[in-house]
């Protein structure tokens, strides 16, 4: 606001007000007189910059007169009371209001007084923001979408991840006129390490108080990667059951596990049990490569380990053993 | 019913004062500037000076600063204006009116005639 | 000062005509505008003020436009009880002036 005037009557306003699409808005405007000055005031009008006449006119006899009765409204000024507040709400906000506007007063002694007002015409995006499910293509690809629907001014969007990524952001006009549908795609490579985790979108806008932050949980299809464990290279006769385990990462989750051997099915010291594969104790050195096949919706991977059990003291091993 | 009623004619000599009166009745004297204008025959119209009855403030034409003054009985709500030195081309017809920005009433008009 | 300049300075319509009296500011007014319409005889009566918003009891023949420095003082219809002599005044800044006044007369 302004600073008030000093020894001269002062108009006082905002230079600039916002209003919503559809809402109505006040345009403060007053007239500060200071103590010892003496003002009469007969005339408050409201006019919009480049527009011939005004939109509203309170006369000290003839009360309000307005360019549009029916969405404007002194909403202080009043016939038979001093003229000092002059302002104008607004009803029905449309896009073509934003402008800038003088409130003038029509002053005795001083002459007129006016003050610009700068009126901004809002409307509160909606915000939505979805994974992209994808599957591994080896190059960019869009991986999550955040809409702002329907801003005025078209709100900013931005991502944020340490998966590094590449944002592509359009524009297209709002399903109400003067506003904008803002669309962000977050581009990156997929891969299974991209799977599960989470990038951000935030969406700041000047009708929000502060940036709206939504979060998305990404999703990448891909075949299942197999690997087994449970094996260190140092088993032996006389040992106990061990087992193994076939671990897969798979999106979507493993359909089925599949252990064989490069022989063909598997040994009798073998068991398969979805997953894991017991091995039983034996009584003769074994060398066998075993193979973990599994299975999801993209297809099949399969993952092999070559097991020796080897003769070794018994006192020294615990041993692979019948107890 | 807002009236503004003013003195008769005025006949003057070059040099001599006049001063006219403007009685209001029909509407809250004090709460509207009186102004004057004045209107040589058949010539356009030339706003003089207004004051506010409650103040006592006053704006003057610039073209009369010197010569005119103003002012108010709030007891009989009558404004007067009195201007002086007077020369042949102050001749006119003198109107006070009720300032609203504009003026929405107007006096019937005292003639004064300047001439030697 | 600002100076009204009014245009034509006298002109004459008949009866039913559209009657069209300009007036420009030498600098901008805004809406602060008012037009007068002085019949012989009488002192001027307020037709419209803040240039387009008509006074109660004005016929709604008369209208005011414009802002700035052109001003429009339109007669729809002309009528017989119209002869009179038009002014424009603006009160945005003192000194307020006034036009020099159109004369209109009936054919």
């Known amino acids: 606001w302004p600073p008030p005037g000093t020894g001269d009557v002062v108009v006082q306003a905002p230079t600039q007000v916002p209003g919503f699409l559809g809402d109505s808005v006040t345009l403060p405007c007053y007239l500060q007189v200071p103590n010892m000055e003496v003002t009469h005031v007969s005339q408050l009008t409201w006019a919009r910059h480049g527009e011939s006449g005004s939109m509203a006119v309170f006369h000290q006899t003839q009360g309000p007169s307005y360019s549009e009765s029916k969405r404007l409204e002194f909403v202080a000024a009043r016939l038979g009371a001093e003229l000092r507040n002059a302002s104008l709400r607004m009803f029905g906000l449309r896009v073509e209001d934003e402008g800038n506007y003088t409130c003038l007063f029509v002053t005795f002694p001083q002459g007129s007084r006016s003050v610009d007002i700068w009126l901004r015409v809002l409307a509160k995006p909606q915000n939505t923001a979805e994974v992209q499910k994808v599957q591994l293509t080896g190059e960019p690809v869009p991986m999550a979408r955040c809409v702002s629907t329907g801003g005025r001014p078209p709100a900013q969007i931005t991502w944020h991840s340490d998966l590094g990524g590449m944002p592509n952001t359009s524009q297209v006009p709002g399903f109400l006129s003067g506003t904008v549908t803002v669309t962000s795609l977050w581009i990156l490579v997929p891969s299974s390490q991209v799977d599960g985790k989470n990038v951000t979108c935030k969406v700041e806008h000047e009708s929000f108080e502060k940036p709206q932050l939504l979060t998305v949980n990404l999703t990448v299809y891909y075949p299942p990667e197999v690997s087994i464990s449970g094996y260190d290279n140092n088993w032996y006769l006389g040992q106990n059951e061990a087992t193994l385990t076939c671990d897969a990462r798979s999106n979507p989750e493993p359909t089925g596990y599949n252990w064989s051997t490069t022989m063909g099915p598997l040994p009798p010291f073998a068991v398969a049990q979805g997953a894991q594969l017991l091995i039983r104790p034996v009584d003769k050195p074994i060398n066998t490569t075993l193979i973990c096949n599994v299975t999801n919706a993209l297809g099949a991977r399969q993952a092999e380990l070559t097991v020796q059990v080897k003769e070794g003291p018994p006192s020294e091993h615990s041993g692979i053993s019948r107890n | 019913e807002v009236q503004l009623v003013q003195s008769g004619s005025e006949l003057k000599k070059p040099g001599a004062s006049v001063k006219i009166s403007c009685k209001t009745s029909g509407y809250t004297f004090t709460e509207y500037t009186m102004h004057w204008v004045r209107q040589p025959h058949g010539k356009g119209l030339e706003w003089i000076g207004g004051?506010?009855?409650?103040?006592?403030?006053?704006s003057y034409n610039q073209r009369f600063k010197g010569r005119v003054t103003l002012t108010v009985d709030k007891s009989t709500s009558t404004a007067y204006m009195e201007l002086s030195s007077l020369r042949s081309e102050d001749t006119a017809v003198y109107y006070c009116?009720?300032?609203?920005?504009?003026?929405?009433?107007w006096g019937q008009g005292t003639l004064v005639t300047v001439s030697s | 000062d600002i100076v009204m300049t009014q245009s034509p300075s006298a002109m004459s319509a008949s009866v039913g005509d559209r009657v069209t009296i300009t007036c420009k500011a030498s600098?901008?007014?805004?809406?602060?505008v008012a037009w007068y319409q002085q019949k012989p005889g009488q002192p001027p009566k307020a037709l419209i003020y803040?240039?387009?918003y008509r006074y109660s009891g004005v016929p709604d023949r008369f209208t005011g436009s414009g802002s700035g420095t052109d001003f429009t003082l339109t007669i729809s219809s002309l009528q017989a009880e119209d002869l009179a002599e038009y002014f424009c005044?603006?009160?945005?800044?003192?000194?307020?002036?006034f036009g020099q006044g159109t004369k209109l007369e009936i054919k």
């Open positions: 005044q603006q009160y945005q800044s003192y000194p307020y002036t």
């Open positions: 600098q901008n007014v805004g809406t602060n």
């Open positions: 803040s240039a387009s």
């Open positions: 004051i506010h009855p409650n103040s006592g403030g006053t």
């Open positions: 009116a009720r300032w609203t920005g504009d003026f929405d009433y």
